[in-house]
Structure formats: structure tokens, C-alpha cells
Interface confidence: low
């Protein structure tokens, strides 16, 4: 706000006052007079810039007019006191009432003296996130979805990720009249990295204290992706039973495990239990390929390994596996 | 001339699902809400939900959250109320209605010809 | 559960003036309830009057006018027809669902 001034009255109110769609506001405005200034109101005046007549008027005699009784409410001003407040609660805002606002003291002997004030009407926005859940499309599509609806001014949605990609940002009418709904769509390729990873919409809006943050988790659905652990290239005869584990990830989660051989079936001293293989202790060399095979909704897939027992003990006969 | 033409009458068991459509023509499509409100018999309006169709955004009636979709085919100008786990007490008339746009405000402003959904055993 | 309610009916006589009221439960209806008023003429399709408390419909008759009436909505008929006997539903927006009203009957004779 201006500072008061030293040797003439000035009329006092902020630059621009924010108000929310369908609540009530309050235009302040107040009428500075320096200490030993001599003055006499007689009339306080709110217009609207563009509009011919008064919107508010309050008369040293006659009290207040408004051209929306049921709208508009001067706050402090009374008659029998002096009127220095010139503040006026509208009520019921409405998007049509954003604009430039004059409001005018009409003093003795300083003449009439006014200030201008930009009301902003603005629409807080309800804000949700969600996920687009994918499968491996091999092109980029949208991830997550982020919506801010009913904004005014609209609202501005960034994204952080770590993981690439890129927005996709639109605006469509709110179902409020002068309010808009954003819809920011966050786009990748899908990959099997991407899964359970999580990327997150900011939303701005000059309503806000600070910016809302809404996390996503997102999901790529994809078949398995598999490997085989257990075998360190030092297997022997003679050692203790080892075991082979089948390593899968895929999403959703595998609905079976199948372990076979490059020659066919599982040969007696293998023995499958789930996603292990349990090897028993043989009596002489093998060199097997062994296979397993991993399904889920999307598909198998599979990994081989070929297991070598070798001849001449170990050192220790702490079992053929290292695990 | 704006018009919404919607599906036939469907009988449904409890417990079954409906899908209903409602085909616009004489105006922009994707550019308009679309409000889905019902009427038992005897008794007065119940709005289900509204859907923007230019993005498929939409607000649904808490009371019904969980049991319906709303969802737009802009190819064909036609949106579609599914309501699933359907009740005897959901036997009503199911009604789309375009919202116009008078400057200030929407309003409900064409509706179409209802479709009766009755749900027995 | 904010509920809405009108008149179940009213009868007005041709040419004359009826005024039928939307009242809420949650308090006095303003403009943010964007009141809308409905008409459903017997075997016909239901027609919008009024939207936003007291914006007509392109093609709805002068006669028709929406407003706030102490803490009501309201629709006035002014010079009634015959062709105005029908059921008029008012809807409420309260922030995220429109309420119906129950529907008013009017009679003209």
C-alpha cells in the first residue's frame, strides 16, 4: 500500500485484492488524513470501470444505495460517525465481477479524491493423481495422469522424475463458469525399470500456500524377465546337495515355475520345488544345460545354465554349491 | 437440431450390470458436458454424474461412486452409464442431458428419451 | 445430505402469475447453487427453463424468469398458458452434485 501522505489526504487501498468464487470479498479502502489537515466527507462512491453509475454509494445523510442490495455491504461506514472507511463487502462473487474499481471520498474542501483496485476472483482447484497403468508398448504413452480441476486462473502442472519422459499438458472448460480444468499426462516408453517407480505432479495456483505434490507409483505390467543364480562354476563330486534358484521379475507376479533340460525332463538327481532346483550328489561328471521357464498373465519366458560337477574333491566338502 | 438418442429398454437381473448409450448430434460434441440423472417410478430426479466430453473428465454422485462409469466415444458422438451390481431399487429411467451454456452459467439444456432399466429376478 | 424441496403443487389460473420456491437444508440458496429449473410436460421430454438462478434458456418464453427469493430459489410464471401445465424440477449445485427437487405440479385452470 502507498505510504500516507504528509500535506493532503490520500485515499488508501492495495493494488489488486484476490477473492474466491462464490465466497464474499472485502475492497478495502480507507481515507488518510495527516494530523492537523482539516477535512469533511460527505460521500463515499464505489464504481466500476467501464459502467456508468455508482455500484455503492454512502451519502453523510441519507445513508447507503446499492445497485445489488443483496450483494454488496459497506463494512464500516455509519451514519452520525465520519467517514474515513470506505471499505465494501461484496458477497456471492461471481466471475463477471473481476475488475478495475474506483473508489472516490468526496471531501470539503480537498474535493474528491479516489483510488483504483483490481479485483481478482479466483477458484482454488481440487487437485488428483493417478496412475495410467501400461504394459510394454514399446512407444511412449501416458504413465500418469495428473488433473486440477475448477481452477481460475488455471492452475500449472510441472512433473519431477527421474525416469525421463516427457508432459503432455490440455485445458478444457470447468464445470463453474470462468474456471478451467488442466490435465497433465506424463509420457515414457514403458520399460520393466519403470515399474513400481514413482514420478510426482506439482500443482501451482496463486490459492495455494505452497505447491501440492501428488505421487504416483507407477505400473508397467511385463512378462518375466528371468535369470538362474546358485552355480559358481565350482561344483565337485562327492559334495553335499546344491541348489539352483530361478530368478524372475515381472509384473504381475509369476503364476508358475517350470524346470526342465536341454535334453528334455529333469534327470533323477534334480528335483524341482518351485523356483528352486535342488541337486542331489552324483557319482560321476555331468555337464547339463538346465532350463527354467517362468509364466505369468503376459507370457513365459526363459533362462538356461549349464551346471558342470567336476572330478577332484574340494578343498573343503562344504557342498557342491557356494551358496 | 440438437438431439440425444438414447439405447432401448433392458431387463437385468441383481447383481448384473447395464450399459446405457446416448448418441448427440447437432452439435459439438467434445466441446459439452453430458449430466446422466435418473427416475424411479412414482419418485422425483436423482443426478448420477456429469462427463466433459472433450477429455472424459467426469464427477460422480458419491452415492453412486464405485458402481458406475462414465465413459464418451467421440468417434461416434456417444456417451455410455454403466452401473454394475445392479439392485431392484435401481429400476428406474435413465436419462442423458446435454448442458448449454447461457454466459453466466450451465443449464440442463436437452435431454434425451430415457431408458428404462428394470431390474428382477 | 443436503436435501431440496419444493412445492408438491400449485394451481394458477390462466393469464395469471405463480411463483414456485426451491428451498435447501444447508441454508439459503445464492448464485454459487447455480439453481436450474426443469420442465416435464406429460409424454414429453424434459425441457430446461433456467439455469445459473436466473439465466432462460435460448427459446424459453419471457414469461419465465428465474430469481432468489429471500432464501429460496424461485421461478415466476407471469401470464400463464395452458400449455405451462407440466412438472417443474429445481436442481442445486453444492459443490461437487446437483440435488433434484421433488417436483411441482402445476395446474393451470
Known amino acids: 500500500w502507498p505510504p500516507p501522505g504528509t500535506g493532503d489526504i490520500i485515499v488508501q487501498a492495495p493494488t489488486q485484492v484476490p477473492g474466491f468464487l462464490g465466497d464474499s470479498v472485502t475492497l478495502p479502502c480507507y481515507l488518510q488524513v495527516p494530523g492537523m489537515e482539516e477535512t469533511h466527507v460527505s460521500q463515499l462512491t464505489w464504481s466500476r470501470h467501464g459502467e456508468s453509475g455508482s455500484m455503492a454509494v454512502f451519502h453523510q445523510t441519507q445513508g447507503p444505495n446499492y445497485s445489488e442490495p443483496k450483494r454488496l455491504e459497506f463494512v464500516a461506514a455509519r451514519l452520525g460517525t465520519e467517514l474515513r472507511d470506505a471499505s465494501l463487502r461484496m458477497f456471492g462473487l461471481r466471475v463477471e465481477d473481476e475488475g478495475n474499481y474506483t473508489c472516490l471520498f468526496v471531501t470539503f474542501p480537498q474535493g474528491s479524491r479516489s483510488v483504483d483496485i483490481w479485483l481478482r476472483v479466483l477458484a482454488k482447484p481440487q487437485n488428483t493423481a493417478e496412475v495410467q497403468k501400461v504394459q510394454l508398448t514399446g512407444k511412449p504413452v501416458p504413465v500418469a495422469r495428473c488433473v486440477s480441476t475448477g481452477g481460475r486462473p488455471p492452475a500449472h502442472i510441472t512433473w519431477h522424475s527421474d525416469l525421463g519422459g516427457m508432459p503432455n499438458t490440455s485445458q478444457a472448460p470447468g464445470f463453474l463458469s470462468g474456471t478451467v480444468t488442466v490435465t497433465s499426462l506424463w509420457i515414457l516408453v514403458p520399460s520393466s525399470q519403470v515399474d513400481g517407480k514413482s514420478v510426482t505432479c506439482k500443482v501451482e495456483h496463486e490459492s495455494f500456500e505452497k505447491p501440492q505434490l501428488l505421487t504416483v507409483n507407477l505400473t508397467v505390467y511385463y512378462p518375466p524377465e528371468v535369470s538362474i543364480s546358485g552355480y559358481d562354476n565350482n561344483w565337485y563330486l562327492s559334495q553335499n546337495e546344491a541348489t539352483l534358484t530361478c530368478d524372475a521379475r515381472s509384473n504381475p507376479e509369476p503364476t508358475g515355475y517350470n524346470w526342465s533340460t536341454t535334453m528334455g525332463p529333469l534327470p533323477p538327481f534334480a528335483v524341482a520345488q518351485g523356483a528352486q532346483l535342488l541337486i542331489r550328489p552324483v557319482d560321476k561328471p555331468i555337464n547339463t544345460t538346465f532350463i527354467c521357464n517362468v509364466t505369468n498373465a503376459l507370457g513365459a519366458r526363459q533362462a538356461e545354465l549349464t551346471v558342470q560337477v567336476k572330478e577332484g574333491p574340494p578343498s573343503e566338502p562344504s557342498g557342491m554349491s557356494s551358496n | 437440431q440438437v438431439q440425444l438418442v438414447q439405447s432401448g429398454a433392458e431387463v437385468k437381473k441383481p447383481g448384473a450390470s447395464v450399459k446405457v448409450s446416448c448418441k448427440a448430434s447437432?452439435?459439438?460434441?467434445?466441446?459439452?458436458?453430458i449430466s446422466w440423472v435418473r427416475q424411479a417410478p412414482g419418485q422425483g430426479l436423482e443426478w448420477i454424474a456429469w462427463i466433459y466430453a472433450g477429455t472424459g473428465d467426469t464427477n460422480y454422485n458419491q452415492k453412486f461412486t464405485g458402481r458406475v462409469t462414465m465413459t464418451t466415444d467421440t468417434s461416434t458422438s456417444t456417451a455410455y452409464m454403466e452401473l454394475r451390481s445392479l439392485r431392484s431399487d435401481d429400476t428406474a429411467v435413465y436419462y442423458c442431458?446435454?448442458?448449454?451454456?447461457?454466459?453466466?452459467?450451465?443449464?440442463?439444456?436437452?435431454w434425451g428419451q430415457g431408458t428404462t432399466v428394470t431390474v428382477s429376478s | 445430505q443436503a436435501v431440496v424441496t419444493q412445492e408438491p403443487s400449485l394451481t394458477v389460473s390462466p393469464g395469471g402469475t405463480v411463483t414456485l420456491t426451491c428451498r435447501s437444508s444447508?441454508?439459503?440458496?445464492?448464485?454459487?447453487?447455480?439453481a436450474n429449473w426443469v420442465q416435464q410436460k406429460p409424454g414429453q421430454a424434459f425441457r430446461g427453463l433456467i439455469g445459473h438462478t436466473n439465466n432462460r434458456a435460448p427459446g424459453v418464453p419471457a414469461r419465465f424468469s428465474g430469481s432468489l427469493l429471500g432464501d429460496k430459489a424461485a421461478l415466476t410464471l407471469s401470464g400463464a398458458q395452458p400449455e405451462d401445465e407440466a412438472e417443474y424440477y429445481c436442481?442445486?449445485?453444492?459443490?461437487?452434485?446437483?440435488?433434484f427437487g421433488g417436483g411441482t405440479k402445476l395446474t393451470v385452470l
Open positions: 444447508t441454508g439459503a440458496v445464492t448464485t454459487s447453487n447455480l
Open positions: 442431458a446435454r448442458h448449454g451454456y447461457t454466459g453466466r452459467g450451465w443449464y440442463f439444456a436437452v
Open positions: 447437432g452439435y459439438t460434441f467434445t466441446s459439452s458436458y
Open positions: 436442481a442445486l449445485w453444492y459443490s461437487n452434485k446437483f440435488v
